[in-house]
C-alpha cells in the first residue's frame, strides 16, 4: 500500500519588531521533530502594523490595542487554532524605545505595559515585551542571516541552496540600518576585540564564535537626518536652510521644536531666532556627503582603529549582508545588484540627487512624498556610513550583499531572537537522524 503522510507536526512562533518608524509582526514555522536542526525555521507571514512606531504612542497609549489588532488577528488566521495556545509571542522594541527611555523611563514603561496588556488578550502564549539592547539587535541579526545562509550547518554540500552561499563555513557579517540606530556585527580575523562592550562569545552547533558588534544609537537614517538638520541650521543665516541632500525645488517647513525633540539632536541644540525654518533642496550629492561626514567624529580613537565617535572597529573581514533600510533604500534606488561597483553607485546617486523634485514626483507617482523626498539623503547616508564610517573601500564594496530576504525569510534580528528564546540553536551539534520515523506510515 502507498505510504500516507501524517498530518504535519509543526510549530509556530510570532515576533513583533517594534522599530522606531513602524512595527512589523513575523510568523515563523518549523517541523516539530527538527527543532534543533539548522535552517528549518522559515517565515510564513509578515504583517506591517499600520501607523508609526510604538514610541509615538506617548500621550495616547490607550490607542495601542487598536493599533495592534489587525496584525494580531492576521496571526490568528494564519496559525491553526489548535496551535494558538502553544505559539509563543515575543515583542522586541529597538532604538525608538531606547531613545524614549533615555527621555523618560516612566513613559517608556507605560508604553510597554500597555503593549503587554494588549498582547496578553490574544490566545497565544505571550512571552513578554521588552526593549532589546543594541548589542542584542546586532547579535540576533547576525544569527538570523547566518542561520538562513546555512553557515551553522556542519554538513558540506555539493549544491548551493542560497544565492550568496560560497559553500564554506565562514560566516557573513551583518549590517543593519534602522530609523534610529545602525548595527555592525562580524567575526574579525584573528583580531583581539579591544573593547569588552563590543565582544560576544557564542557556541553554536559545536563551534565557538568570537563576534564583534556595535550599535550606533542616533545613526539610523531618520535620526541621522535630524542630526544633520540640527547641525546645519546652526550656521544658517536665516530661517531658510539650503540643503544639498534634497532635490532641487523641494521645499518643506520644519518646526524647531520637532528638531530638538529627540535626544539625538541635543548636542546641536541652540536658541534660534525663529520657531520654524524652511528646507530648500539644492540636490548636490558631494555637498550632502560632506555635510553627513560632519556627523562622524573621526578625530579621536583610543584603540588601534575606530569606526567613528571613538568606537572600536576591527579590520573588516569576509562578506557582509546589509539588510533592513540598507536594503530598502538601495532597492528603491535600483542599486542592490552584485554587479554595481561603489563608483557606479556614487555616480547614480549624484544623478539621482540632482534630479528636480517635480521630475522625481512624476517618475515615482505612487510613492509617498515623505519617503520619496528622503531617498537622496538616505542613499548618500548609506554610502557615507559604509565608506567613511565603517571603512569599506571601492574594493571591499563587492563583499557587501544587499539582502531583503533569504529563502523567503526577512533578514533582520527577529528570527535570531526567536531562535534564541525558544532554545532552537543548540550549543552542541545535534546527533544527525537521517529520517524521522514519524514522517511516514
Amino acid at each position: 500500500t502507498q505510504n500516507k503522510a501524517l498530518p504535519e507536526n509543526v510549530k509556530y512562533g510570532i515576533v513583533l519588531d517594534a522599530g522606531s518608524s513602524h512595527t512589523s509582526l513575523y510568523i515563523y514555522k518549523w517541523p516539530a521533530e527538527k527543532e534543533n536542526d539548522t535552517g528549518v525555521v522559515h517565515q510564513v507571514e509578515e504583517c506591517r502594523v499600520k501607523g508609526p512606531g510604538i514610541s509615538k504612542f506617548v500621550q495616547k497609549v490607550n490607542e495601542i490595542g487598536i493599533y495592534l489588532t489587525d496584525c494580531m488577528e492576521r496571526a490568528r488566521e494564519v496559525i491553526p487554532r489548535s496551535q494558538h495556545q502553544e505559539t509563543p509571542v515575543y515583542l522586541g522594541a529597538t532604538a525608538g524605545m531606547r531613545l524614549l527611555r533615555m527621555e523618560s523611563e516612566e513613559l517608556a514603561d507605560r508604553v510597554l505595559d500597555v503593549v503587554e496588556r494588549s498582547l496578553s488578550n490574544y490566545p497565544f502564549d505571550f512571552q513578554g515585551a521588552r526593549i532589546i539592547t543594541g548589542q542584542e539587535e546586532g547579535a540576533y541579526g547576525w544569527i538570523t542571516i547566518n542561520y538562513l545562509l546555512g553557515k551553522f550547518s556542519q554538513k558540506t554540500r555539493w549544491f548551493s541552496i542560497v544565492p550568496y552561499e560560497t559553500n564554506n563555513q565562514e560566516t557573513f557579517g551583518a549590517l543593519d540600518l534602522g530609523g534610529a540606530s545602525t548595527q555592525v556585527t562580524f567575526v574579525p580575523q584573528n583580531q583581539t576585540i579591544e573593547s569588552p562592550d563590543n565582544a560576544l562569545q557564542f557556541r553554536l552547533y559545536g563551534k565557538d564564535y568570537n563576534v564583534y558588534t556595535h550599535s550606533f544609537l542616533c545613526y539610523g537614517k531618520d535620526q541621522a537626518l535630524w542630526q544633520k538638520l540640527a547641525k546645519d541650521i546652526q550656521v544658517a543665516s536665516n530661517e531658510i536652510l539650503r540643503d544639498p541632500c534634497f532635490h532641487p525645488g523641494y521645499k518643506k517647513v520644519v518646526n524647531v521644536s520637532d528638531l530638538y525633540k529627540t535626544p539625538c539632536t541635543k548636542r546641536f541644540e541652540m536658541t534660534l531666532p525663529f520657531q520654524q525654518f524652511e528646507i530648500q533642496g539644492i540636490g548636490n550629492y558631494q555637498q550632502c556627503h560632506q555635510s553627513i561626514l560632519e556627523l562622524f567624529n573621526t578625530s579621536y580613537c583610543p584603540y588601534s582603529q575606530c569606526a567613528f565617535n571613538g568606537i572600536f572597529l576591527p579590520p573588516l573581514q569576509g562578506d557582509f549582508g546589509a539588510f533592513s533600510a540598507f536594503y530598502f533604500v538601495m532597492k528603491f534606488l535600483n542599486l542592490t545588484s552584485e554587479k554595481v561597483s561603489q563608483e557606479k553607485v556614487t555616480e547614480m546617486m549624484k544623478k539621482f540627487c540632482a534630479q528636480p523634485w517635480e521630475e522625481i514626483k512624476t517618475s515615482y507617482a505612487g510613492v509617498k512624498e515623505k519617503y520619496l523626498s528622503e531617498y537622496c539623503f538616505s542613499g548618500t547616508y548609506i554610502l557615507s556610513l559604509l565608506l567613511q564610517g565603517y571603512h569599506f573601500t571601492a574594493d571591499s564594496w563587492e563583499h557587501i550583499h544587499f539582502i531583503g530576504k533569504i529563502q523567503g525569510s526577512d533578514a533582520g534580528w527577529t528570527l535570531g531572537y526567536m531562535l534564541n528564546l525558544t532554545n532552537m540553536i543548540p550549543a552542541e551539534q545535534p546527533l544527525s537522524t537521517p529520517l524521522s520515523h514519524s514522517t511516514y506510515v
Epitope: 506617548v58 500621550q59 495616547k60 497609549v61 523618560s104 513613559l107 507605560r110 518646526n255 520637532d258
Partner: antibody, heavy 121, light 107 residues
Framework: QVQLVQSGSELKKPGASVKISCKAS????????MNWVRQAPGQGLEWMGW????????TYADDFKGRFVFSLDTSVSTAYLQISSLKAEDTAVYYC??????????????WGQGTLVTVSS | DIQMTQSPSSLSASVGDRVTITCKAS??????VAWFQQKPGKAPKSLIY???YRYSGVPSRFSGSGSGTDFTLTISSLQPEDFATYYC?????????FGQGTKLEIK
C-alpha cells in the same frame, strides 16, 4: 506643584484673530498632552480637542475644525489656542486642561484659570 | 457623539445632607467617566476619574460609581463649600463630551 497659567482676557472685533496662551509649570511639559475646553456664558463645558506635546499631533472635535488652531512652544512649556475670523458666538471662557494618564486612560486633571474672549463690534 | 444626560439639572439641599447626582451615557463608555466641580467665575476642579476613583486631595465624602451607561456622584454629607455646579464627562470616545451640569444650591 502643577500649575497652568493662562493669558488675560481679550476683547476683539468680529473678523479679528486672537491667540491665547497656557503656560505650564511643575511638571515635564512634553510628558502630558493639553486639552482645550470652551464654556460660553452661562453654558456648560465643550471639549475642543487636544494637542500631543510630545509629537505635535492635533486632535480636534468636529465643531472646532477650521478656525481653531492649537500650537506649542516647548522651549517655554506653553500651549496656544488661536481663533481666527472671530464671531460673536465665540465669546466664551477658554480653558486649557492637562491630559494625564490615570488607570489605563487619559483624563483632565489640572485646569488653567480660563481666558475670557469677548467678541463684540 | 455620546450624549451625557445629567439629572437633576438643579438641586436644593442643606449642609449635612446626602446628595446623589446621576449621569446617563447614550452609549456604553465603560468606566471612562470623570466628575468635575465648578464654582462661579472659577475653573472646573477634577474630583473623580475612572467612574469611582478620587483624585488626591479630594475629600472622602465625594464618591463615584457606575459603569457602562449609568453613573452617579454622591456627596455623603454636604459641606458649605460643596455648593457648586457638577459636570460628568466621558472620555471613552472622541469627541469627549460633558453632561449639561447639575447646579447644587443651598436650601
Amino acid at each position: 506643584q502643577v500649575q497652568l497659567v493662562q493669558s488675560g482676557s481679550e476683547l476683539k472685533k468680529p473678523g479679528a484673530s486672537v491667540k491665547i496662551s497656557c503656560k505650564a509649570s511643575g511638571y515635564t511639559f512634553t510628558h502630558y498632552g493639553m486639552n482645550w475646553v470652551r464654556q460660553a456664558p452661562g453654558q456648560g463645558l465643550e471639549w475642543m480637542g487636544w494637542i500631543n506635546t510630545y509629537t505635535g499631533e492635533l486632535t480636534y472635535a468636529d465643531d472646532f475644525k477650521g478656525r481653531f488652531v492649537f500650537s506649542l512652544d516647548t522651549s517655554v512649556s506653553t500651549a496656544y489656542l488661536q481663533i481666527s475670523s472671530l464671531k460673536a458666538e465665540d465669546t466664551a471662557v477658554y480653558y486649557c486642561a492637562r491630559r494625564a494618564y490615570y488607570r489605563y486612560d487619559y483624563v483632565m486633571d489640572y485646569w488653567g484659570q480660563g481666558t475670557l474672549v469677548t467678541v463684540s463690534s | 457623539d455620546i450624549q451625557m444626560t445629567q439629572s437633576p439639572s438643579s438641586l436644593s439641599a442643606s449642609v449635612g445632607d446626602r446628595v446623589t447626582i446621576t449621569c446617563k451615557a447614550s452609549h456604553n463608555v465603560g468606566t471612562n467617566v470623570a466628575w468635575f466641580q465648578q464654582k462661579p467665575g472659577k475653573a472646573p476642579k477634577s474630583l473623580i476619574y475612572s467612574a469611582s476613583y478620587r483624585y488626591s486631595g479630594v475629600p472622602s465624602r465625594f464618591s463615584g460609581s457606575g459603569s457602562g451607561t449609568d453613573f452617579t456622584l454622591t456627596i455623603s454629607s454636604l459641606q458649605p463649600e460643596d455648593f457648586a455646579t457638577y459636570y460628568c464627562h466621558q472620555y471613552n470616545n472622541y469627541p469627549y463630551t460633558f453632561g449639561q451640569g447639575t447646579k447644587l444650591e443651598i436650601k
